[in-house]
């Protein structure tokens, strides 16, 4: 009998040590005024009723889509941040209610549990070699420019860490939910030829170049492997209806109308009980009916209510990957580092990223033992 019990708390943007300590309506306390809070509730109601799981995930996984939505909705920064937290929770809730997502969650989890140990080992090796690369450069000349090598090798590594991490990044062809930059592979190949420095003797330059080349080629092989798995299993499931641009702008306009209507209602005495009606909302995929999710409420989820009995850990993997991708942005920036010291820092951040993925792996593994 396994000696451990696994529990996946539903994360909220601001996890609380004591989820029961605040009144229900106070989930955004400290950051928003009551009017904004009511608007967020209205917006969540709209998303629950009118937007499909796929489209919501698109919004949350595609940075451009999210920015387009925020711009179209004319949301101030604080409201956009709060809405994002609430939508993260809504997406989790929608996934929990959807049988297809349940099955896929299991499939992704099984794949991840099977593949992660090997991938982890290879990524550890990559991190070690990046450190060795930094040391090699440092020994030749402390200020040597290695930006090209780094941008080539690390952008792919961080991409793999975030993609491979949970074994289920939404990665499809045809422009759907691609989380890695288009043309990145070409950029990496080009980067391999980019190491030039008068301070490096030919032998050292060749060594560094060979190391970087080997590292990148191996990483690309892994990306290809992950891509193939994801391509087979996710492309149909996360295929998007219509044009992404139109979709996100359309939702954004609806939310803007909702926000304005709410603002107008706030100025009328006793009007807050009535909810503004949004005309011609962006519907879920053609003909698809999104199940209305009633219990537990988004507000409860935002306060950290645990749904252990309802939801296996695997349900939330897709969004955890999304978060890791968002949190990797500075790694991509760090990939432009020019000195060995900076490269070591980026390698350390990659190591921390791998640690986070490993933490998730251990929890999933323990869950499977039960």
């Amino acid at each position: 009998e396994a000696g451990a019990r696994v529990q996946q708390n539903v994360p909220s943007g601001t996890d609380t040590g004591d989820p029961q300590s605040k009144p229900l309506g106070d989930w955004a306390a400290g950051t928003m005024d009551p009017e904004s809070s009511i608007f967020i509730e209205d917006a969540i109601k709209y998303f629950k009723e009118k937007v499909s799981t796929q489209n919501l995930l698109l919004l949350l996984t595609d940075n451009e889509a999210w920015n387009g939505f925020v711009a179209a909705a004319e949301l101030p920064r604080n409201e956009a941040d709060e809405l994002r937290k609430a939508l993260d929770n809504l997406a989790r809730q929608m996934i929990m209610k959807d049988k297809n997502w349940h099955d896929k969650g299991q499939q992704y989890r099984n794949w991840f549990l099977k593949e992660f140990p090997r991938l982890k080992s290879e990524l550890e090796d990559n991190i070690r070699r990046l450190r060795a690369l930094a040391d090699g450069v440092q020994k030749v000349h402390k200020g040597t420019t290695i930006a090209n090598v780094v941008s080539g090798s690390l952008s792919i590594s961080s991409g793999i860490l975030t993609l491979v991490g949970m074994g289920l990044a939404p990665f499809t062809e045809g422009g759907s939910l691609v989380l890695l930059e288009p043309g990145m592979e070409l950029g990496i190949t080009a980067a391999l030829t980019g190491i030039t420095s008068s301070t490096m003797d030919y032998g050292k330059k060749w060594w560094t170049q060979a190391q970087a080349h080997d590292l990148v080629i191996k990483s690309l092989d892994k990306l290809k492997e992950v891509r193939e798995f994801l391509g087979e299993n996710i492309s149909n499931f996360l295929s998007l209806a219509g044009n992404t641009y139109q979709l996100t702008r359309g939702i954004g306009k609806d939310i803007r109308a909702l926000r304005r209507a709410r603002a107008n209602l706030q100025s009328v005495p006793h009007a807050s009980a009535s909810r503004p009606r949004v005309t011609e909302p962006i519907s879920a995929e053609s003909g698809e009916q999104v199940e209305r999710v009633n219990e537990p409420s988004i507000l409860e989820m935002s306060r950290g209510v645990k749904l252990t009995d309802v939801a296996p850990v695997g349900f939330f993997l897709v969004l955890d990957v999304v978060y890791l991708v968002y949190e990797s942005k500075h790694l991509h920036e760090g990939a432009k580092s020019e000195t060995a010291e900076e490269l070591k820092k980026v390698a350390q951040e990659l190591e921390e990223k791998l640690n986070m993925l490993n933490n998730n792996y251990k929890i999933l593994q323990a869950d499977q033992e039960l």
Epitope: N9, K120, D320, M356
Partner: antibody, heavy 121, light 106 residues
Framework: EVQVQQSGPELVKPGASMKISCKAS????????MNWVKQSHGKNLEWIGL????????IYNRKFKGKATLTVDKSSSTAYLELLSLTSEDSAVYYC??????????????WGQGTSVIVSS | QIVLSQFPAILSASPGEKVTMTCRAS?????VHWYQQKPGSSPKPWIY???NLASGVPARFSGSGSGTSHSLTISRLEAEDTATYYC?????????FGAGTKLEIK
Amino acid sequence: EVQVQQSGPELVKPGASMKISCKASGYSFIVYTMNWVKQSHGKNLEWIGLINPYNGGTIYNRKFKGKATLTVDKSSSTAYLELLSLTSEDSAVYYCARGALYRYEGAMDYWGQGTSVIVSS
Amino acid sequence: QIVLSQFPAILSASPGEKVTMTCRASSSVIYVHWYQQKPGSSPKPWIYATSNLASGVPARFSGSGSGTSHSLTISRLEAEDTATYYCQQWSSNPLTFGAGTKLEIK
């Protein structure tokens, strides 16, 4: 400098519940798991469980199922251990300890100073 | 669950002596970690993954072992080594500790 600071000693009545806090500083809180360990009579160490601050995922030692609840507050980099329905058997020193990097899986590299809990009427 | 048994429970030796303490697992483990604890203090990581000394640990300490048998050795005992040493595993859930070996200086 990595530091793990726990809340002070507690004297609680049987049947009550209580919560111990563990504030982390000097590192990125979401990157490392936080473990909780019970030490009774200054001797045996028992692992209660761990929490992944990144997403709230937890693993519990079955022995502590229904007795302990682990939570985190990312905004304040604080982990919490809540002990329920306390009895004299729960009198002990409770430690929080950061999980080490993956290469030393299962190890705990930074420990809090411990919180002494005495259950007595 | 995997039970870790530590031998001896109490180890008494003179300064300068070589001492070895053992940690036996009820099932094979990938590696063990060792901690040192002095009275009134928290445990400190001492040896990671069977044989890697934690930061600041004197080189007179070493760790070895595999499978079900692991050991911690001090090549030349010093007074400051007086403490209780615990082994720990996480090859399977739950994570478990040994009952400790109390090292005393004669």
